[in-house]
């Protein structure tokens, strides 16, 4: 009883709680390096709370402190694959607002087929988070290959 | 002064800081895949705090989003041991209840003798995770290049 | 009853949300094999709430379990190069007190130019942390490649 | 540190069987895995079968089905049995042993791996 009562005064939200674990939805057309995501209980076990999906993309509501968290698995791919279409380089990065671009993580395959990796940056609410993959080879849409995540940690 | 009165009334168990950090016991018998996992002060940095081992296993105490990290070393492993052995696969799924089997997380070691990854997921009381080894390496037993965890993260 | 007494009055920064994000500042010299880290929000964005740096070295303030991660690339690195200059390997651990020193995460580059990983661990006030790259080969300081850092989780 | 004793080799006739015998001595407790491999002339050493400390078994694709893997723990021995022999199975066949060891005044594992001297099996009409 007493727990609902606190619950009452400071609505979980409030904690900023803000999550989201996204699932590839495809390559994006022609020129465009970007991967398209989405997220849902419908989709899976991907699942938005707090920032949103605008077309595609990310997008930040509560400013904060993230820890962003990427894998890319690449789908017919074999060690030798990797090297011979070197490089395929994995970048994510804040694309909007553009006074605000800039690269936040950047992996290159080599000679994997899998890059993953996670870290801690400021975001600000109306940041969008886009992930460029460069090179030739295609992402895996296998759910537990590729996922894409953001984790409020502190304000 | 509302928010430090709903502070008031929050054990700080409440607040759901279910977390685990494993070390690898051993790997399975006969045919099995499973990795068997241990922790506790004992035994060095390892600890469980809230979920429970069962017969090696992770199982979920509390509902919520989780941050699952994992990290692998081969044992006796070089880029060339790992692409002749190749492929080697680690896996981490919801193996019971079977209602709920899933995998959740997959890497190949392709040319590398280190896999490492992250994801948030959606887990509920009863859920035991397991990680799936399979190839023919070894898995290293150091505890600073083998462990498995989760944290939770929100309800 | 004393523990609830003291919850009533923890504002949310006593609740233990320290958190570092590092970016390379150089590595050490001679027969050093430290990376020497770099952090706050003129330098772009690396910061520190909470543990310090001591001599380019992450000093934590606050007991508790801890999530530590970190992503070192290698800054003119091929597959080739990588594989000819190994072992090439990152090490985190406690390097002060001796008496608390311990490697707690540890890999090797192999055939890769980039490791990233991520482990949780109890870490005490004091501890000061330090990340040993050994090996001929020189880690990039671009932010997006390079960067090591830790979060509290809960006590 | 463990040595690794072979026997059992020979030859047999397509589809015949063969038993093969690796002894271990030494500091047998610090032993991880125990296999066998095998070397046809002019190709790589590849991994035939495996067995860990808890019992554990992997195989080959090539052999699955016809070669089984198994201990003896009183008696320090891994054996293979080779059912449903080819002439492809021809080769020369080595015991492997992965050893974990604890660094001396350290938490932490060392990893070696020892060979037996081999043992010749020719499948042959």
């Known amino acids: 009883q007493r727990f609902a009562q606190a619950q009452q005064q400071l609505p979980l939200e409030s904690l900023g709680w803000d999550v989201a674990e996204l699932q590839l939805n495809h390559t994006g057309p022609q020129q465009d390096p970007r991967l398209y995501w989405q997220g849902g209980p419908a989709l899976g076990r991907s699942f938005l709370h707090g920032p949103e999906l605008d077309k595609g993309q990310l997008r930040i509501h509560r400013d904060g402190i993230y820890m962003v968290h990427i894998q890319v698995t690449l789908a017919i791919c074999s060690s030798t694959t990797a090297s011979r279409h070197h490089p395929t380089t994995l970048a994510v990065g804040i694309c909007s607002p553009a006074s605000r671009s800039i690269s936040l993580l950047r992996l290159s395959f080599h000679q994997g087929c899998t890059i993953a990796s996670q870290r801690l940056t400021p975001l600000a609410r109306g940041d969008t988070l886009c992930t460029n993959l460069t090179g030739t080879l295609l992402p895996s849409r296998n759910t537990d290959e590729t996922f894409f995540g953001v984790q409020w940690v502190r304000p | 002064q509302r928010f430090a009165q709903a502070q008031q009334q929050l054990p700080l168990e409440s607040l759901g800081w279910d977390v685990a950090e494993l070390q690898l016991n051993h790997t399975g018998p006969q045919q099995d895949p499973r990795l068997y996992w241990q922790g506790g002060p004992a035994l060095g940095r390892s600890f469980l705090h809230g979920p429970e081992l069962d017969k090696g296993q992770l199982r979920i105490h509390r509902d919520g989003i989780y941050m699952v990290h994992i990290q692998v070393t081969l044992a006796i492993c070089s880029s060339t041991t790992a692409s002749r052995h190749h492929p080697t696969t680690l896996a981490v799924g919801i193996c019971s209840p079977a209602s709920r089997s899933i995998s959740l997380l997959r890497l190949s070691f392709h040319q590398g003798c280190t896999i490492a990854s992250q994801r948030l997921t959606p887990l509920a009381r009863g859920d035991t995770l397991c990680t799936n080894l399979t190839g023919t390496l070894l898995p290293s037993r150091n505890t600073d290049e083998t462990f498995f965890g989760v944290q939770w993260v929100r309800p | 009853q004393r523990f609830a007494q003291a919850q009533q009055q923890l504002p949310l920064e006593s609740l233990g949300w320290d958190v570092a994000e590092l970016q390379l500042n150089h590595t050490g010299p001679q027969q050093d094999p430290r990376l020497y880290w770099q952090g706050g929000p003129a330098l772009g964005r690396s910061f520190l709430h909470g543990p310090e740096l001591d001599k380019g070295q992450l000093r934590i303030h606050r007991d508790g379990i801890y999530m530590v991660h970190i992503q070192v690339t290698l800054a003119i690195c091929s597959s080739t190069t990588a594989s000819r200059h190994h072992p090439t390997t990152l090490a985190v651990g406690i390097c002060s007190p001796a008496s608390r020193s311990i490697s707690l995460l540890r890999l090797s580059f192999h055939q890769g130019c980039t490791i990233a990983s991520q482990r949780l661990t109890p870490l005490a006030r004091g501890d000061t942390l330090c990340t040993n790259l050994t090996g001929t080969l020189l880690p990039s300081r671009n932010t997006d490649e390079t960067f090591f850092g830790v979060q509290w989780v809960r006590p | 540190q463990v040595q690794l004793v072979e026997s059992g080799g020979g030859l047999v006739q397509p589809g015949g069987s063969l038993r093969l015998s690796c002894a271990a001595s030494g500091s047998i407790f610090s032993i991880y895995a125990m296999g066998w491999y095998r070397q046809a002339p002019g190709k790589q050493r590849e991994l035939v079968a495996l067995?860990?400390?808890?019992?554990?078994?992997n195989y080959a694709d090539s052999v699955k089905g016809r070669f089984t893997i198994s201990r003896d723990n009183a008696k320090n021995t891994v054996y293979l049995q080779m059912n449903s022999l080819k002439p492809v199975d021809t080769a020369v066949y080595y015991c492997?042993?992965?050893?974990?060891?604890?660094?001396?005044?350290?938490?932490?594992?060392?990893?070696?791996?020892?060979w037996g001297q081999g043992t010749l099996v020719t499948v042959s009409s």
């Open positions: 067995i860990t400390n808890s019992g554990g078994t």
């Open positions: 492997n042993a992965v050893e974990e060891e604890v660094v001396a005044g350290t938490d932490r594992y060392r990893y070696l791996e020892v």
